[in-house]
Interface confidence: low
């Protein structure tokens, strides 16, 4: 139904408090650049404004759509150019075109400092002050750092946060209660960034039907009792919440959310009987349950897909009447047989069986064309368990940080363009990703790799499209989302690549490496193996070995030595001459 | 198509400068890191400078540094390569590549420092 003022229908159907930390996140996820305080300073005129709209709908302005009314507060900041430069041209736009300008100007890799988390002490003492004034400070950090988080998630991460702080200031040992609680919230929320840039980046570069597609898969999985209509009932209502969210529409987002979650909970008996745990908890925590639901279990006596999809008379009609209908519901009835495959992995079987029907069903004998079509998709499903299987035997004979230097390796030789720190930083994810998952049961361990590694390359591609250096990388980025993961894994020796001029300065080091912590001591010996690549890419696995091992002595000795940096200044150019000579 | 045609080489005495320039068409130049690579007769290609796409961002050898400046005029599209106090070991033809990819250079253009 249509609403006299949409900002005060928002405030109404949210609540003052998860109205101001949505508006809030909307201004820290589109002016990255300024202090908390005017932030707060704005938070509370729209806050006001909202409260005015409730009072009387028909008062001035308060008609305006709201990413209308946020455009309008953005452009009266005074020093908006002095501290956004061009994204003031923005406000010599008109709405829709205005909105679209703010969202191209969201940087995904702002230059902030991580966000350090203060002493236990300092934390309580602070929270103990104020905690809305806290938490909206936690809000603020997050959001400034990770420009399409998910807003209602946030919200229900700052309420863990909340929770965690007011249990464990009270506590003996805050830090040992506080550590591991804050921790989880980290890790988890660091996933939840990653997964929602995904989503906006496949409704952004690849449009609906990817994005639906993929929730198709998702969805089907979770819930393989509920029918296929009412699968898609979700996946529109889905897509609706996550345009709004990618979009900067946080309110509608949020409200539209709740909304979901409330059909999902009123039709539970047809979807799910996991749902029942999720129904009975407060908004937040309700959305968030059936967000990270365990997934059902299969129903009993699900016919062969073969019947369907191939023995069928009517498989080409079907295709030909109704082509999205028909390969949903293939996507649909195979994802609900396969939870242990990746979403990739389900949307490249159902896109290569298209890519089967389009042929065959031109062809005078249709059926004889694609009888073999499930024969010809295997590859799909062994490709990826190969490369799982190979790649966690790897894991488990190097441990992490060997693993991450293979891939270290492994990846400069494919795009060797790629900065340094940016080909380190995705090195150590990548390998990370054999922790996360490699020690899981076979049946978890290929979705658990592939779902994490499109997500690290989801984050490779948009920092790369920012400033593009490798075409290789650029065409595995954007000709096809689901190939992404097969794109790179396909690439090997950039045989184009001109190797870099050996600079003694990438292997020179000082005594200050001996006392850093061991996390930052990997990371400057990464930095110095991938330059070695890009110096030598065609460098043997022998003469990596050998160089590596040459380094590891070298930095043990002069660690150990009493007077370290006469040792690093003496054996340095040493280790150097005799790198050369081993890669020459 | 992707094209990228080089000029302002030439003879120059050591010690002179010269401005390569590389016209740049058929792709989003803005997008695109570019650099300079030269090759020197009968020798492998070798690196010599880098830019971001924005230009904000470069990058240039040992043997180059203090003396070339590469920039780009991103309305033109086009980059350039600024040489002065040039030495005979700075002969070779100086290609114009997208990233550091010589799969993706223009014809080259001749350099020559001799007095």
């Known amino acids: 139904e249509a609403h006299k003022s949409e900002i005060a229908h928002r405030f109404n159907d949210l609540g003052e408090g998860h109205f101001k930390g949505l508006v809030l996140i909307t201004l820290s996820q589109h002016l990255q650049k300024s202090p908390f305080e005017e932030h707060v300073k704005l938070v509370n005129e729209v806050t006001d404004f909202a409260k005015a709209c409730v009072a009387d709908e028909s008062a001035q302005n308060c008609g305006k759509a709201i990413a209308t009314l946020f455009g309008d507060k953005v452009c009266a900041i005074p020093s908006l150019r002095e501290t956004y430069g061009e994204l003031a041209d923005c406000c010599a736009k008109e709405d829709p075109d205005r909105v679209e300008c703010f969202l191209q100007h969201k940087d995904d890799n702002p230059n902030l400092p991580p966000f350090e988390r203060p002493e236990p002490e300092a934390l309580c003492t602070a929270f103990k002050e104020n905690n809305d004034r806290f938490i909206g400070h936690y809000l603020y950090e997050v959001s400034r750092r990770h420009p399409y988080f998910y807003a209602p998630e946030l919200l229900y991460y700052a309420e863990k946060y909340k929770n965690a702080l007011t249990e464990c200031c009270e506590a003996a040992d805050k830090a040992a209660c506080l550590t591991p609680k804050l921790d989880a919230i980290k890790e988890k929320a660091l996933v939840s960034s990653a997964q929602q840039r995904l989503k906006c980046a496949s409704l952004q570069k690849f449009g609906e039907r990817a994005f639906k597609a993929w929730s198709v898969a998702r969805l089907s999985q979770k819930f393989p009792k509920a029918e296929f209509a009412e699968i898609s009932t979700i996946v529109t209502s889905l897509t609706k919440v996550t345009k709004e969210c990618c979009h900067g529409d946080l309110l509608e987002c949020a409200d539209d959310r709740q909304e979901l979650a409330k059909y999902m909970c009123e039709h539970q008996d047809s979807i799910s009987s996991k749902l029942k745990e999720c129904c009975v908890k407060p908004t937040l925590q309700k959305a968030h349950c059936i967000l990270e639901i365990q997934r059902d279990e299969l129903p009993t006596e699900l016919p062969d897909l073969a019947v369907d999809f191939v023995e069928d008379k009517e498989v080409c009609k079907n295709f030909a009447e109704a082509k999205d209908v028909f390969l949903g519901t293939f996507l649909y009835e195979y994802s609900r047989r396969h939870p242990e495959y990746s979403i990739g992995m389900l949307l490249r079987i159902a896109k290569g069986y298209e890519a089967k029907l389009e042929k065959c069903c031109a062809e005078a004998d249709p059926h004889a064309c694609y009888a073999k079509v499930f024969d010809e998709l295997q590859p799909l499903i062994d490709e990826p368990k190969k490369l799982v299987q190979q790649n966690c035997e790897l894991f488990d004979k190097l441990g992490e940080y060997g693993f991450q230097n293979a891939l270290a390796v492994r990846y400069t030789q494919k795009a060797p363009q790629v900065s340094t720190p940016t080909l380190v930083e995705y090195a150590r994810k990548l390998g990370s990703v054999g922790t996360k998952c490699c020690s899981l049961p076979e049946t978890e361990r290929l979705s658990c790799t592939e779902n994490y590694l499109a997500l690290i390359l989801n984050r490779l591609c948009i920092l790369h499209e920012k400033t593009p250096v490798s075409e290789r990388v650029t065409k595995c980025c954007t000709e096809s989302l689901v190939n992404r993961r097969p794109c790179f894994s396909a690439l090997h020796v950039d045989e184009t690549y001109v190797p870099k001029p050996f600079h003694a300065d990438s292997f020179t080091f000082h005594a200050d490496i001996c006392t850093l912590p061991e996390k930052e001591k990997q990371v400057k010996k990464q930095m110095a193996l991938v330059e070695l690549v890009k110096h030598k890419p065609k460098a043997s696995e022998e003469q990596m070995k050998t160089v590596m091992g040459d380094f590891a002595a070298f930095l043990k000795k002069c660690c150990d030595a009493d007077n370290k940096e006469a040792c690093f200044t003496e054996d340095g150019p040493k280790l150097v001459a005799k790198c050369q000579a081993t890669l020459a | 198509d992707v094209q990228l045609v080089e000029s302002g080489g030439g003879v120059v005495q050591p010690g002179g400068s010269l401005r390569l320039s590389c016209a740049a068409s058929?792709?989003?130049?803005?997008?695109?890191?570019m650099s300079w690579v030269r090759q020197a007769p009968g020798k492998g290609p070798e690196w010599v400078s880098s830019i971001s796409g924005s230009g904000s961002d470069t990058l240039y050898a040992d043997s180059v540094k203090g003396r070339f400046t590469i920039s780009r005029d991103n309305s033109k599209n086009t980059l350039y390569l600024q040489m002065n106090s040039l030495r005979p070991e700075d002969t070779a033809t100086y290609y114009c590549?997208?990233?550091?990819?010589?799969?993706?250079s223009g014809q080259g253009t001749l350099v020559t420092v001799s007095s």
């Open positions: 058929g792709f989003t130049f803005t997008s695109f890191g």
């Open positions: 590549t997208i990233g550091g990819s010589l799969s993706r």
